[in-house]
Interface confidence: low
């Protein structure tokens, strides 16, 4: 019969015949012949390949590197890779997660606007007048100046964008 | 447990180059970045750059760019550091260092440049 | 990167505490929970003793502790010990996969 010139699914040509591809979680190690089926090997602790192959190598696992402020959302198996995310207090560099930087602390005179995700910055804003932060943080808003009035205090000091008012007694001499 | 054995003390010429090695052993080469530090004599310690042994990449400190080149042989899990264009004052103590945090470092290796 | 400012000396009696000071900016120490610690003693390599701002790698002891409060980092050294006598340097994330080191404190035991 006439040699093949293409093969069926999960098939590949090779010396003039059509071989198995090796199944997901395995790797070639000897191509068929007319006697023999594809020879596969599964992939080894920590390796990985996801598709129907003719790879003489797996992947490695992807290594979520503490150093970059990764760690593992779901371990790899045979057939599929390492997922990592970012520690708490840190987001992606890029939708494949291969490393990772530390969220911002927005500094004392500006509060969190938006808090940062696992694929997103802090976005700070300036404290605008009646509202202050004294602290750097990743998570405090800017909080409201203190009402003294509702204390029935009066304004000792006024407030920054740093500090909060200082309330004190009223003056009872005043009328 | 890491350990990083770097090559020996090198003596160079003002305008020559030194390439220094850092090979590891213990956990997998690929899994960590290498960070390489300088210590110039009686002075502080200075981080010139790191190299990702897994994909090569690097970033390198910005008065250092264009100087220093860090590479990675995989086969010998062994990352290098090169420093071209000398001046006395790069004399120094060259450390490898594992990771940004730094929690393992090489014995280190002096480099004196003199003419 | 400018280098982070540490005191270039400090001392303390055996027994007592001792604060190492390293005051960086709004875009490395006070931007990122990343300052790591070390010591050295002369003719050695540094030895990693504080990591992420606070934390201790195993096998460090708890008379080390550090803090951070806006763009400066504290290192505390508390019932000193002769052989706490030695250069502590800080070192911060800056951003970009850029650190900075500080210019070193020598810590003399009285």
């Known amino acids: 019969p006439e040699p093949p010139t293409a093969c069926r699914e999960k098939q590949y040509l090779i010396n003039s015949q059509c071989c198995s591809l090796c199944q997901p979680g395995q790797k070639l190690v000897s191509d068929c012949t007319e006697f023999t089926e594809t020879e596969c090997l599964p992939c080894g602790e920590s390796e990985f390949l996801d598709t129907w192959n003719r790879e003489t190598h797996c992947h490695q696992h992807k290594y979520c590197d503490p150093n970059l402020g990764l760690r593992v959302q779901q371990k790899g198996t045979s057939e599929t890779d390492t997922i990592c995310t970012c520690e708490e207090g840190w987001h992606c560099t890029s939708e494949a997660c291969e490393s990772c930087v530390l969220h911002r602390s927005c500094s004392p005179g500006f509060g969190v606007k938006q808090i940062a995700t696992g694929v997103s910055d802090t976005i700070c804003e300036p404290c605008p007048v009646g509202f202050f932060s004294n602290v750097s943080s990743a998570f405090e808003k800017c909080h409201p100046w203190t009402s003294c009035e509702t204390k029935d205090l009066v304004v000792q000091q006024a407030g920054t964008n740093k500090t909060d008012v200082v309330c004190g007694p009223q003056d009872r001499l005043r009328a | 447990q890491v350990q990083l054995v770097q090559s020996g003390a090198e003596v160079k010429k003002p305008g020559s180059s030194v390439k220094v090695s850092c090979k590891a052993s213990?956990?997998?080469?690929?899994?960590?970045?290498i960070s390489w530090v300088r210590q110039a004599p009686g002075q502080g310690l200075e981080w010139m750059g790191m190299?990702?042994?897994?994909?090569?990449?690097?970033s390198y400190a910005q008065k250092f760019q264009g100087r220093v080149t860090m590479t990675r042989d995989t086969s010998t899990s062994t990352v290098y550091m090169e420093l071209s264009s000398l001046r006395p004052e790069d004399t120094a103590v060259y450390y490898c260092a594992r990771g940004f945090r730094m929690d393992q470092w090489g014995q280190g290796t002096l480099v004196t440049v003199s003419s | 990167q400018s280098a982070l400012t540490q005191p270039p000396s400090a001392s303390g009696s055996p027994g007592q505490s001792v604060t190492i000071s390293c005051t960086g900016t709004?875009?490395?120490?006070?931007?990122?929970?990343?300052v790591s610690w070390y010591q050295q003693h002369p003719g050695n390599a540094p030895k990693l003793i504080i990591y992420?701002?606070?934390k201790r790698p195993s096998g460090i002891p708890d008379r080390f502790s550090a803090s951070k409060s806006g763009n400066t980092a504290s290192l505390t050294v508390s019932g000193l010990q002769a052989d706490d006598e030695a250069d502590y340097y800080c070192s911060s994330y800056a951003g970009n996969n850029e650190m900075v080191f500080g210019g070193g404190t020598k810590l003399t035991v009285l």
């Open positions: 213990g956990g997998t080469f690929s899994s960590y970045a």
């Open positions: 709004s875009s490395d120490v006070g931007a990122y929970n990343f």
């Open positions: 190299i990702n042994p897994s994909g090569g990449t690097t």
């Open positions: 992420d701002v606070r």
